[in-house]
């Protein structure tokens, strides 16, 4: 018969022959022959391969180094790598999450638009007219100015993006 030029899914072509790929979690020891099947071996502890493959070496699990602010989100297995995330208050510096940095705080005059997660930083926004923030915080949104009218008071000092309005008593009308 003619030697194949293409192989089925989960097979690979070698020496004009279709051999079975090794399943996830196993590495290739020897290619198949006319008389023998592909020989595969399980990955060692703390190693993995996540696809049907013909790799001769397994990949090492990622180490979520606590000294870099990392912690394990999902433990590695023979078929999957370890997934790292950051300790609370920190977020990954890259998609691969190889290290972490402290969440940014929003300065006075700015409020938190989106709270940071393990993978994204704090998003700040300037406090619009009618709102203020007088603290540096990674959690606080802009607060609305106090409504003096609802307290039967008048504005004594105007608010800014960093300060609340100051309310005071209304001047009594003289007889």
């Amino acid at each position: 018969p003619e030697p194949p030029t293409a192989c089925r899914e989960k097979q690979y072509l070698i020496n004009s022959q279709c051999c079975s790929l090794c399943q996830p979690g196993q590495k290739l020891v020897s290619d198949c022959t006319e008389f023998t099947e592909t020989e595969c071996l399980p990955c060692g502890e703390s190693e993995f391969l996540d696809t049907w493959n013909r790799e001769t070496h397994c990949h090492q699990h990622k180490y979520c180094d606590p000294n870099l602010g990392l912690r394990v989100q999902q433990k590695g297995t023979s078929e999957t790598d370890t997934i790292c995330t950051c300790e609370e208050g920190w977020h990954c510096t890259s998609e691969a999450c190889e290290s972490c940095v402290l969440h940014r705080s929003c300065s006075p005059g700015f409020g938190v638009k989106q709270i940071a997660t393990g993978v994204s930083d704090t998003i700040c926004e300037p406090c619009p007219v009618g709102f203020f923030s007088n603290v540096s915080s990674a959690f606080e949104k802009c607060h609305p100015w106090t409504s003096c009218e609802t307290k039967d008071l008048v504005v004594q000092q105007a608010g800014t993006n960093k300060t609340d309005v100051v309310c005071g008593p209304q001047d009594r009308l003289r007889a």
Partner: antibody, heavy 119, light 113 residues
């Protein structure tokens, strides 16, 4: 036959130190990750620390971080737990357990060694 | 940390009767890469170290009698003993094997009525 034999337990004063050992036999020690798990008298199980087969990866429970150190010597088929700044709440039976590269579970536990922290 | 909650704390059942115990995790134990739930059950008989019973939620460890079965997914898991034998008297612990820190449930103590 798989065996995990402990030594090093005993009575120690608060603030003191102790080193536990776990000697492995009956399997290829260097192929397995290893854990320490403890059990306070009459209580449940609490994971303490893990070390990967090749020494590259180490994780600790927050309760022991900075005080306990897990290590291994594959040439001697031995696992260790160095315990410093011991507290009364560290009093427990300490087990070593192995983790293989297939199940990723603690598939064999040794007999425990008792650590008592008391003045 | 993942909190594992077991119920009941203890139960007394007649020999030959069915035993069911529950384990709930505070977050999913499903590995997104291989679609396995990393929930493990250990059996601890009085005066002995724990022994692996079931891993990946429902796979029995070699040598474990088939009267033991595990089920569940995500955050809700169950261990069943189809017909209780005298040698099954023990405390059964479920364990999060999904992430570090590894965490255990408080245990369910099984006794004979």
């Amino acid at each position: 036959e798989v065996q995990l034999v402990k030594s090093g337990g005993g009575l120690v004063k608060p603030g003191g130190s102790l080193r536990l050992s776990c000697a492995a036999s009956g399997f290829t020690f260097s192929d397995y990750g290893m854990h320490w798990v403890r059990q306070a008298p009459g209580k449940g199980l609490e994971w303490v620390a893990y070390i990967s087969s090749g020494n590259r990866i180490i994780y600790y429970a927050d309760t022991v971080k900075g005080r306990f150190t897990i290590s291994r010597d594959n040439a001697k088929n031995s696992l260790y737990l160095q315990m410093n700044s011991l507290r009364a709440e560290d009093t427990a039976l300490y087990y070593c357990a192995r983790q293989d590269g297939y199940r990723y579970a603690m598939d064999y536990w040794g007999q425990g060694t008792l650590v008592t922290v008391s003045s | 940390d993942i909190v594992m909650t077991q119920s009941p704390d203890s139960l007394a059942v007649s020999l030959g009767e069915r035993v069911t115990m529950s384990c709930k995790s505070s977050q999913s134990l499903l590995n997104s890469g291989n679609q396995k739930n990393y929930l493990t059950w250990h059996q601890q008989k009085p005066g002995q170290p724990p022994k692996l019973l079931i891993y990946w939620t429902s796979t029995r460890e070699s040598g474990v009698p088939d009267r033991f079965s595990g089920s569940g997914s995500g955050t809700d898991f169950t261990l069943t003993i189809s017909s209780l034998q005298a040698e099954d008297v023990a405390v059964y612990y479920c364990q999060n094997d999904y992430t570090y820190p590894l965490t255990f449930g408080g245990g369910t103590k099984v006794e004979i009525k």
